[in-house]
């Protein structure tokens, strides 16, 4: 039995998979900030988690996926305000009783030290200093990501 949050996550991921392939992204679009091989977009407004997920999808991106603690720290360094929380692409899967990224993978317990409960309708937010479990209905800011395409020894003609 999937929760409404899980279903929303799956639906959006499937619709993203159905879209036609686009050429790789070599530079971050305007308003997006580059962090290593990603482009990040920090929202100005607030939304519950599923609306944030949908907003990123409309921008041909996804809610932020964090690979490891190092990436978390670098992302947090871009947050200038201690008091602001941002949704990322991680929520609690009731059916699997585990934290699940929106790409379908499960959280490695060593990656993030989450403050708060792991329970139904819980989603993960990050601040400048910490990682929190919040009710998914809470309205906070969010972070979208786009992956940059690595360029390996390719020679491009002058455009």
């Amino acid at each position: 039995q999937k929760s409404s949050i899980e279903k929303c996550s799956v639906d959006i991921q499937q619709s993203r998979n159905k879209t036609t392939e686009r050429p790789g992204l070599l530079n971050c679009p305007i308003y997006w900030q580059q962090l290593r091989e990603k482009c990040l977009l920090f929202s100005h407004t607030v939304n519950p988690w599923n609306n944030s997920l949908a907003d990123c999808s409309t921008k041909e991106s996804s809610l932020l996926l964090i690979r490891d603690k190092d990436e978390l720290i670098h992302t947090q360094n871009l947050i200038r305000d201690k008091a602001i929380l941002f949704w990322i692409g991680l929520n609690f899967s009731l059916s699997e009783k585990n934290w699940k990224w929106i790409n379908g993978s499960f959280l490695n317990s060593n990656d993030l030290e989450i403050r708060g409960d792991a329970k139904e309708n819980s989603c993960i937010s990050i601040s400048q200093t910490s990682v929190y479990s919040e009710y998914c209905s809470t309205e906070i800011r969010w972070i979208c990501q786009k992956e940059l395409t690595p360029v390996r020894n390719k020679v491009y003609p002058d455009s």
Epitope: P29, I30, Y31, Q33, L41, F42, H44, T45, K59, L78, I79, R80, D81, I84
Partner: antibody, heavy 119, light 108 residues
Framework: QVQLLESGPGLVKPSETLSLTCTVS????????WSWIRQPPGKGLEWIGY???????NYNPSLKSRVTISVDTSETQFSLKLSSVTAADTAVYYC??????WGGGFDYWGQGTLVTVSS | EIVLTQSPGTLSLSPGERATLSCRAS???????LAWYQQKPGQAPRLLIY???SRATGIPDRFSGSGSGTDFTLTISRLEPEDFAVYYC?????????FGGGTKVEIK
């Protein structure tokens, strides 16, 4: 309603640095991207660059080597510095705000300040 | 960079007439990130339309925008005396942000 007010010298000598400040009132400096736009007398509009409250900036490549935009969140101000100016930099300089991908276009503008480059 | 070409350069019309202003982009404007502004002498530009077709707050419904990709249009259904001004289009989907050269709508 957000209000923007430009301030700075109206006359700058060639080869010197043009410095302007935009003061933001009635709005959160954390909720917008803050741009400088200029308009030479009788001509069109040219975007110079923007800054986000985090300090992340984006500049027009045509001016990038000469431009610095900075933000002071505690004073709710952002500033423009344009180095090595010439007569071609004579223009009305506007500060403006936009919400990036969540808004659309520059919804708030300062009244503009004319900067003349002359010896 | 995306170059925006506005036409005509000048439009001479009478109050009550319909004005149709064109803005053509050198490449596709992503997500219809296109805005229109009105500027009167000695004043800052005023946002009219964003997202190609959405009216900004407080803008009368005689102003409408349409188009996508590379071709965009601003229509003023019935010109009022206060509408005679210069109109600029602007794209905000790619860096650098760019403006069109403007269309002057003058009284015939």
């Amino acid at each position: 309603q957000v209000q923007l007010l430009e301030s700075g010298p109206g006359l700058v000598k060639p080869s010197e640095t043009l410095s302007l400040t935009c003061t933001v009132s009635n709005g959160s400096i954390r909720s917008y991207y803050w741009s400088w736009i200029r308009q030479p007398p009788g001509k069109g509009l040219e975007w110079i660059g923007y800054i986000y409250y985090s300090g992340s900036a984006n500049y027009n490549p045509s001016l990038k080597s000469r431009v610095t935009i900075s933000v002071d969140t505690s004073e709710t101000q952002f500033s423009l510095k344009l180095s090595s100016v010439t007569a071609a930099d004579t223009a009305v300089y506007y500060c403006a705000s936009d919400r990036g991908p969540w808004g659309g276009g520059f919804d708030y503008w300062g009244q503009g300040t004319l900067v003349t480059v002359s010896s | 960079e995306i170059v925006l070409t506005q036409s005509p350069g000048t439009l001479s019309l009478s109050p009550g007439e319909r004005a149709t202003l064109s803005c053509r982009a050198s490449q596709s404007v992503s997500s219809s990130y296109l805005a229109w502004y009105q500027q009167k002498p000695g004043q800052a530009p005023r946002l009219l339309i964003y997202g190609a077709s959405s009216r900004a707050t407080g803008i009368p419904d005689r102003f409408s925008g349409s188009g996508s990709g590379t071709d965009f249009t601003l229509t003023i259904s019935r010109l009022e005396p206060e509408d005679f001004a210069v109109y600029y289009c602007q794209q905000y989907g790619n860096s650098p942000l760019t403006f069109g050269g403007g269309t002057k709508v003058e009284i015939k």
